[in-house]
Interface confidence: medium
C-alpha cells in the first residue's frame, strides 16, 4: 500500500552580502522602524531566492535576524522540509552551491527576477552553514538583548555589559574582511554563575562553538579567544542576579599570524626556544594550522618538546582530536590538557630534520599551546637521572620517591636514597658523603668533594650549572661551589633568641620567625611561612572556596604567637598577589601550594625572618625528626589554638605512606608523623611549615601542611606538600 514519505526539518544558518545597500546604526536596534522595514524586505528576498531554486519545494520558513557592515550583510536562518532519504544529499555545501548557481545565472540577466527587485546580492558573499532547531531556539532567546558591533582595524572595543533584566544576551561582532577577531574576557568578581559561549559565526551554532566559560573562573581570570575570521558571536546566560557585571568583554581585529617556521638547532643540549600557536596565550583559532620544521645538527641528538599542562597521546581509531591534532614524522597524536608537565622525545634518524604540524581539527578550541624545544643526547637522554617513558621527563632515580607514574625510577636500585660506594656497591647514608670521614672501603665517599662532578639525583647544582657531590651543601658556612652560590641567599632559617597542633607545646616569641597567620576578617584561616622579603608560601587549598579567592580579603600576620593579643614584634600585611600552583588539583591535593605577595617588604627582626628554601636535590632523610607549627585545632573537630603550637614529627618513607593512603600520595607529597598518631597537624594548620634543622643549625622548609585522615589518628600520617617537588615553580615566581 501507499506509505507516506518521512519528512525531516533541516536547518541552515548563513549570511549574504548586499552590494547596493549600506549599513546604518539604525539597523542595530531591533525596535527601530529601519530595522523592521529592512528585515521585511530582506526576508522576502531570501524566500524568493530559495524558492527560485529546486530547494523551493522543500521550503518551510526563514528569518533575517540581524544586519552588519559589508556594504550590508544580512544574517539569516531557514528551514527546509526534506524527505529523510535526501537529507545527506542536501548538505550546507550543496545548498550553498545551488543558491550561488542561481545568483550567478541572473547576474547579467535583464529579465525581472523577484529577489533582485530591491537587492543586488553578491554571489561570492553567500555563506551557508549547518544549524539545528536547538540553535535557532538559542538564538531567539537572545533577541531581546541582541547587540551588533563592528570593530575597525586598530580599534579595541569594550563591549557594553549585558542587560540584567534579560536572561540571555548575544553580542554579534564583526571586523574588517581578512582579519580575525580576538575577544578578551576578564572576570571581575570572585564568584558568579554566569556562562559565556563564543562562536566562530554570527549566531549560537553548536557546531561552531569555539569555547564556553562558566562562573568567574579562577583558573583563567583572563581568557583571550580567537575567531577564525572577522565574525564572532558571544552569548551570555545569566547566573545569580547581580547589579555588577562579573566580567568585562573587549574585542579587536588582528592580522593572521603565520604559523610556519624553519629552524636549525644549535649543537647544545637543553631548551633552545619556544614554538607557540598564534597570539599565545590566546586560545588558538578554529582553523589554526602550524607547521614547524626543525633541523638537528647531528644524529647524536634527538629532539625534545617540553609542554606545560599539555600532553600528546595516541588517539585510538580515527576519532578527531578535540584539543589539537599533531603530526610528528607521520605519527598522528592528539593533544590533551593535563595538570602535569610533559615532554615528547623524537628520535632523529635522518638529517633531513623533523616536521611538526599542529591543527585544530574541530571548531572547539582551547588555551594556546606553547612548547619549548631543544636537543637531548640519544645515547644518554637523562644524565644522572632516569628517563620516564610515560611522560618523557627526566626524574631523580633511586631517591625513595616514585616520580614516574609506573614507578620504574625506583626499580632495580642498588642503593635507594643512599650513596653507593664505588668499591663494593655498599650503600651509606647521604649525610656521610663528603663529611671529612671515609665510610666506604677505599674512601670513595670522600673523593671529588672539592671539584665539580656529573650532575645526579643528590648532587647540588651551582649557579654556573656545575654540580657538587656533597649532599645538602646550602648555607652550611663552607663554600662548596666554585662560584660560591651554595652560600648565597643564606640570610634565612635562624630562630630568634627565644626563651596546638595535636600533641604539641606552646612556642615562644621568635622561636619560629617565619610562621605566618593568614586571616580573613580577623579570623585565622591558615598558616604559612615567610620565604622572602615579600613572599609568603602556603597551601593552595586554603583558597579552594570561591569566596576565599580574592586578595582583598586576606591579611597576613608575621611575628605572631598569640591569636587573641598583639605584641610589639608582630606585623601585618595586605596581599597584593595570590598565585596558586598552575597544576594544583583540588580533588587529589596535588601541587597544594600557593604564593602570596605582600603589599610591602618585611623589615627583618628577631621575630620576623624567612625560612631557608631547599634546592631541588635537597634530601630530607626518612626517620628525621622535624617540626610543624600552627594555631590549628588541638584535637580533631576542636577549636583553633590561641597560642602558636609546635610539635616534632618524623619523616616517613614515601612507599610506606603511599601504602597507608592507598596510593593517593603523589611525588609532590611528603609524609610525617607517627604510626601511633598523637602528634599531627589539624584543621587551621593548613599551609603552615614543616621545617627540618640542618647540621648548620639553619631550618629548611621541607613541607606545607596539606591533608590527612583526621588528626593524630593511629596509622595515618600527616601529608605535606613536598617543597623540593615544587621548588622550581617557587623560584620562578619569587625571582
Amino acid at each position: 500500500g501507499y506509505k507516506a514519505e518521512v519528512m525531516v526539518s533541516q536547518v541552515y544558518s548563513g549570511s549574504l552580502r548586499v552590494l547596493n545597500r549600506h549599513f546604518s546604526q539604525d539597523l542595530t536596534r531591533r525596535e527601530s522602524s529601519a530595522f523592521r522595514s529592512e528585515t521585511a524586505k530582506a526576508q522576502k528576498m531570501l524566500k524568493e531566492l530559495i524558492t527560485s531554486t529546486r530547494l523551493g519545494t522543500y521550503y518551510n520558513s526563514s528569518s533575517v535576524y540581524s544586519f552588519g557592515e559589508g556594504p550590508l550583510t544580512c544574517f539569516f536562518w531557514f528551514i527546509l522540509q526534506i524527505p529523510e532519504h535526501r537529507r545527506l544529499m542536501l548538505s550546507p555545501e550543496v545548498v550553498q552551491a545551488l543558491l550561488v548557481e542561481e545568483l550567478l545565472s541572473t547576474v547579467n540577466s535583464s529579465a525581472a527576477v523577484p529577489y533582485r527587485a530591491e537587492y543586488e546580492v553578491d554571489p561570492e558573499g553567500l555563506v551557508i552553514l549547518e544549524a539545528s532547531v536547538k540553535d535557532i531556539a538559542a538564538l531567539n532567546s537572545t533577541l531581546g538583548c541582541y547587540r551588533y558591533s563592528y570593530v575597525g582595524q586598530g580599534q579595541v572595543l569594550r563591549l557594553k555589559g549585558p542587560d540584567h533584566l534579560a536572561s540571555s544576551c548575544l553580542w554579534h561582532l564583526q571586523g574588517p574582511k581578512d582579519l580575525m577577531l580576538k575577544l578578551r574576557l576578564e572576570w571581575t568578581l570572585a564568584e558568579c554563575r554566569d556562562r559565556l559561549a563564543m562562536y566562530d559565526v554570527a549566531g549560537p551554532l553548536e557546531k561552531r562553538l569555539i569555547t564556553s566559560v562558566y562562573g568567574c573562573s579562577r583558573q583563567e581570570p583572563v581568557v583571550e579567544v580567537l575567531a577564525s575570521g572577522a565574525i564572532m558571536a558571544v552569548v551570555w546566560k545569566k547566573g545569580l542576579h547581580s547589579y555588577y557585571d562579573p566580567f568585562v568583554l573587549s574585542v579587536q581585529p588582528v592580522v593572521f599570524q603565520a604559523c610556519e617556521v624553519n629552524l636549525t638547532l644549535d649543537n647544545r643540549l637543553d631548551s633552545q626556544g619556544v614554538l607557540s600557536t598564534p597570539y599565545f596565550p590566546s586560545y588558538y583559532s578554529p582553523q589554526t594550522h602550524c607547521s614547524w620544521h626543525l633541523t638537528v645538527p647531528s644524529l647524536d641528538y634527538g629532539l625534545a618538546l617540553w609542554f606545560d599542562a599539555y600532553a600528546l597521546r595516541r588517539q585510538k581509531y580515527d576519532l578527531p582530536c578535540t584539543q589539537g591534532q599533531w603530526t610528528i614524522q607521520n605519527r598522528r597524536l592528539c593533544g590533551l590538557r593535563i595538570l602535569q608537565p610533559y615532554a615528547e622525545r623524537i628520535p632523529v634518524v635522518a638529517t633531513a630534520g623533523i616536521t611538526i604540524n599542529f591543527t585544530s581539527q574541530i571548531s572547539l578550541t582551547g588555551p594556546g599551546v606553547r612548547v619549548h624545544y631543544g636537543l637531548y643526547n640519544q645515547s644518554d637522554p637523562c644524565p644522572g637521572e632516569f628517563l620516564c617513558s610515560v611522560n618523557g621527563l627526566c626524574v631523580p632515580a633511586c631517591d625513595g620517591v616514585k616520580d614516574c607514574p609506573n614507578g620504574l625510577d625506583e626499580r632495580n636500585c642498588v642503593c635507594r636514597a643512599t650513596f653507593q660506594c664505588k668499591e663494593d656497591s655498599t650503600c651509606i647514608s647521604l649525610p656521610k658523603v663528603c663529611d671529612g670521614q671515609p665510610d666506604c672501603l677505599n674512601g670513595s665517599d670522600e673523593e671529588q668533594c672539592q671539584e665539580g662532578v656529573p650532575c645526579g639525583t643528590f648532587t647540588f647544582q651551582c649557579e654556573d650549572r656545575s654540580c657538587v657531590k656533597k649532599p645538602n651543601p646550602q648555607c652550611d658556612g663552607r663554600p662548596d661551589c666554585r662560584d660560591g652560590s651554595d652560600e648565597e641567599h643564606c640570610d634565612c632559617g635562624l630562630q630568634g633568641p627565644s626563651s596546638r597542633i595535636v600533641g604539641g607545646a606552646v612556642s615562644s616569641e621568635g622561636e619560629w620567625p617565619w610562621q605566618a597567620s593568614l586571616q580573613v576578617r580577623g579570623r585565622h584561616i591558615c598558616g604559612g611561612a615567610l620565604i622572602a622579603d615579600r613572599w609568603v608560601i602556603t597551601a593552595a587549598h586554603c583558597f579552594q572556596e570561591d569566596s576565599m579567592a580574592s586578595t582583598v580579603l586576606w591579611t597576613v600576620f608575621l611575628g605572631k604567637v598569640w591569636q587573641n593579643s598583639r605584641w610589639p614584634g608582630e606585623v601585618s600585611f595586605k596581599v597584593s598577589r595570590l598565585l596558586l600552583h598552575p597544576y594544583h588539583e583540588e580533588d587529589s591535593h596535588d601541587y597544594d601550594v600557593a604564593l602570596l605577595q605582600l603589599d610591602h617588604p618585611v623589615v627583618r627582626s628577631a621575630a620576623v625572618r624567612p625560612v631557608c628554601l631547599p634546592a631541588r636535590s635537597h634530601f630530607f632523610e626518612p626517620g628525621l625528626h622535624c617540626w610543624i607549627t600552627g594555631w590549628g585545632a588541638l584535637r580533631e573537630g576542636g577549636p583553633i589554638s590561641n597560642a602558636l603550637q609546635k610539635v616534632d614529627v618524623q619523616l616517613i618513607p614515601q612507599d610506606l605512606c603511599s601504602e597507608v593512603y592507598r596510593y593517593q600520595v603523589t611525588p609532590r607529597m611528603l609524609c610525617a608523623g607517627y604510626r601511633k598518631g598523637k602528634k599531627d597537624a589539624c584543621q587551621g594548620d593548613s599551609g603552615g611549615p614543616l621545617v627540618c634543622k640542618a647540621l648548620s643549625g639553619r631550618w629548611f622548609l621541607a613541607g606545607l601542611v596539606s591533608w590527612g585522615l583526621g588528626c593524630g589518628r593511629p596509622n595515618y600520617f600527616g601529608v605535606y606538600t613536598r617543597i623540593t617537588g615544587v621548588i622550581s615553580w617557587i623560584q620562578q615566581v619569587v625571582t
Epitope: G400, R416, P622, G623, Q650, I652, P653, Y674, K676, K678
Partner: antibody
Framework: QVQLQQSGAEVKKPGASVKVSCTAS????????INWVRQATGQGLEWMGR????????GYAQKFQGRVTMTRNTSISTAYMELSSLRSEDTAVYYC???????????WGQGTLVTVSS | DIQMTQSPKSVSASVGDRVTITCRAS??????LAWYQQKPGQSPKLLIY???SLQSGVPSRFSGSGSGTDFTLTISSLQPEDFATYYC?????????FGQGTKLEIK
C-alpha cells in the same frame, strides 16, 4: 635517665601462667609503645607483641594470639605481659623494650628468665 | 610475615679489621631496618635505625646502608668490645621480625 626495670625470674609448671612486669622511669610511658621480645637460650630474638600504654591498644604476633595478654597501669608507669598455657619451649628470657611510633626499640629492660619445667 | 635472613651466621675477625654483615628482607621494607648488638647475658642494644641512622652514643665506626630488601652493617675498624652477636630487625610493619643473628668472634 631512661630505664625499664623488669620483675625477677620465675619458675613455672607446664600449663600454668606467668605475669612479667616492666616499670618505666625517666620518660612518660604514654608517649611510647612497650614491646615484649623473648629469647630462648642460645636462640635469636622473637617479637611477641606490644601495647600502647596511652589507650591500652595491643597488637600480638599470630604465634602468641590467644595465649598472651598485655596490660598496663599508667599510674605506676608499669606494663605487664601474661603468658598462659605454658610449655617447656616457652622457657626463655623475656624482655620489655620501648619504641617510639615507627622507630625500633631503643631501650630494653634487663630481661626476666622464665623457666617452664615439671 | 616478613622474613629476615642474615649472613653469615658467624664471622671470625681480628681487631682493626673491617667487617660487613648483610641482611635480606623477604619483601620491600623501604629503609625501616634496625641493627642491634647483644653481648652474652645482656639486653640487646640499638646501633642503627632507619637503615643508616646511628643511635646516639654509638661509635661512628658502625654504619648501616641499603634500602628495599638488602641491607648491610659495616664496622670499619673492629675494637675488642665489638665482639658480640648482631641482629637486624625490620620496623616497617608488625609483626616485627628479626634476623637469626650473626656471631662475631675473635680470630
Amino acid at each position: 635517665q631512661v630505664q625499664l626495670q623488669q620483675s625477677g625470674a620465675e619458675v613455672k609448671k607446664p600449663g600454668a601462667s606467668v605475669k612479667v612486669s616492666c616499670t618505666a622511669s625517666g620518660f612518660n610511658i604514654e608517649d611510647y609503645y612497650i614491646n615484649w621480645v623473648r629469647q630462648a637460650t642460645g636462640q635469636g630474638l622473637e617479637w611477641m607483641g606490644r601495647i600502647d600504654p596511652e589507650d591500652g591498644e595491643t597488637g600480638y604476633a599470630q604465634k602468641f594470639q590467644g595465649r598472651v595478654t598485655m596490660t598496663r597501669n599508667t599510674s605506676i608507669s608499669t606494663a605487664y605481659m601474661e603468658l598462659s598455657s605454658l610449655r617447656s619451649e616457652d622457657t626463655a628470657v623475656y624482655y620489655c623494650a620501648r619504641s617510639i611510633y615507627l622507630d625500633p626499640m631503643d631501650y630494653w629492660g634487663q630481661g626476666t628468665l622464665v623457666t617452664v619445667s615439671s | 610475615d616478613i622474613q629476615m635472613t642474615q649472613s653469615p651466621k658467624s664471622v671470625s675477625a681480628s681487631v682493626g679489621d673491617r667487617v660487613t654483615i648483610t641482611c635480606r628482607a623477604s619483601q620491600d621494607v623501604t629503609t625501616a631496618l634496625a641493627w642491634y648488638q647483644q653481648k652474652p647475658g645482656q639486653s640487646p642494644k640499638l646501633l642503627i635505625y632507619w637503615a643508616t641512622s646511628l643511635q646516639s652514643g654509638v661509635p661512628s665506626r658502625f654504619s648501616g646502608s641499603g634500602s628495599g630488601t638488602d641491607f648491610t652493617l659495616t664496622i670499619s675498624s673492629l675494637q675488642p668490645e665489638d665482639f658480640a652477636t648482631y641482629y637486624c630487625q625490620q620496623h616497617y610493619s608488625t609483626p616485627y621480625t628479626f634476623g637469626q643473628g650473626t656471631k662475631l668472634e675473635i680470630k
